[in-house]
Amino acid sequence: PPRGRILGGREAEAHARPYMASVQLNGAHLCGGVLVAEQWVLSAAHCLEDAADGKVQVLLGAHSLSQPEPSKRLYDVLRAVPHPDSQPDTIDHDLLLLQLSEKATLGPAVRPLPWQRVDRDVAPGTLCDVAGWGIVNHAGRRPDSLQHVLLPVLDRATCNRRTHHDGAITERLMCAESNRRDSCKGDSGGPLVCGGVLEGVVTSGSRVCGNRKKPGIYTRVASYAAWIDSVLA
């Protein structure tokens, strides 16, 4: 089943997020991803936990998962590199780099997204964009077209309250509000974009979606700049 957790959003403008990737297992959408270099897609480590025997591929240039589109292309994965410290039972270090079998053909609908290298928290209240093909309601309906939602960043102290995530939000994680609008199952690995820069990746831990007391958790890419650079080198 799709991993991770867009509720309360709307259909995205087609191909307006040329960095958006669908990480697929055996031809079906599994997780979101974001093109960070010509041959590399960043996603969440937990996405591949149950994918040992399956064929992992990356779809770029897509808006609809099912309809033919000139810009769409499915790439095989040459190498999957989960963060070495990621573990099945924690949300920490939930990052995955996928090396495509070849460099992506770039164009208006396929283009890498600049990612944040300055390790400084995004100011609380900043509106950030999260997009994905994750479920759009609590009944589990999966969309065919890319959805997105704007979410305000939540300060870490609030996110760490006992009734929220009770101290689990480290300096390498960030939170966004989840009051009816939220990332949800199938959005994991997708991008949280603030001011046109990739700031976070949707974590793939299981949590209730759309409940304001359980904010969305995102891995801060700036905190992993050294690791990302070392893999891409």
Partner: antibody, heavy 116, light 112 residues
Framework: EVQLQQSGPELVKPGASVKISCKAF????????KNWMRQRHGESLEWIGD????????NYNQKFKGKATLTVDKSSSTAYMELRSLTSEDSAVYYC?????????WGHGTLVTVSA | DVLMTQTPLSLPVSLGDQASISCRSS???????????LEWYLQKPGQSPNLLIY???NRFSGVPDRFSGSGSGTDFTLKISRVEAEDLGIYYC?????????FGGGTKLEIK
């Protein structure tokens, strides 16, 4: 190692005010709410209120509104609680505690004695 | 405010015995997010309270497995399977689901 270092004991006169401090070590101060509790001698604990160290927004137990004021100084990673119009009923040990996970980390307590 | 009532007030035990402390809330302490924020703390003489159990039954890191928590709704229990000398002190239950958060009156665990 997470530590909350509270200021020393206070002997104050009735009607006076006192400001006690709680300095955080071993973690990023702004990442966790700070809570304050009161414990009178031989009694249980009472929650006074909490404060978000980012915004300085505080929540109070109705019982302590007008009695306690919570503030923070981010530059020194310190939380403060001021108690005013003190009476003998306010004599107690006052604790600060970090919220997250739960109240896993507490200060050692500050004894406030109100006496003429 | 939610009243947390602990029984017994005092619990004399022999070392190695099992101890059981009850905590009852005046209303359900299931939070609107579905979780139950019932915690247990141990306060030793002259010390600050120490977290033992959170969300009814989860042991905090470093807490020995002889401590276990259970219950739901309004009735909760802390059990110590084999009491050791270092377990002596006052045990408090606490609810963090409703504002203001409240503590129980305490149960003093002492040597028989």
């Amino acid at each position: 190692e997470v530590q909350l270092q509270q200021s020393g004991p206070e002997l104050v006169k009735p009607g006076a005010s006192v400001k006690i401090s709680c300095k955080a070590f071993g973690y990023t101060f702004t990442d966790y709410y700070k809570n304050w509790m009161r414990q009178r001698h031989g009694e249980s604990l009472e929650w006074i209120g909490d404060i978000n160290p980012n915004s300085g927004d505080a929540n109070y137990n109705q019982k302590f509104k007008g009695k306690a004021t919570l503030t923070v100084d981010k530059s020194s990673s310190t939380a403060y609680m001021e108690l005013r119009s003190l009476t003998s009923e306010d004599s107690a040990v006052y604790y600060c505690a970090r919220e997250g996970p739960s109240f896993a980390y507490w200060g050692h307590g500050t004894l406030v004695t109100v006496s003429a | 405010d939610v009243l947390m009532t602990q029984t017994p007030l005092s619990l004399p035990v022999s070392l190695g015995d099992q101890a059981s402390i009850s905590c009852r809330s005046s209303q359900t302490i299931v939070h609107s997010n579905g979780d139950t924020y019932l915690e247990w703390y141990l306060q030793k003489p002259g010390q600050s309270p120490n977290l033992l159990i959170y969300k009814v039954s989860n042991r905090f890191s470093g807490v020995p497995d002889r401590f276990s928590g259970s219950g739901s709704g309004t009735d909760f229990t802390l059990k110590i399977s084999r009491v050791e000398a270092e377990d002596l002190g006052i045990y408090y239950c606490f609810q963090g689901s409703h504002v203001p958060p409240t503590f129980g009156g305490g149960t003093k665990l002492e040597i028989k």
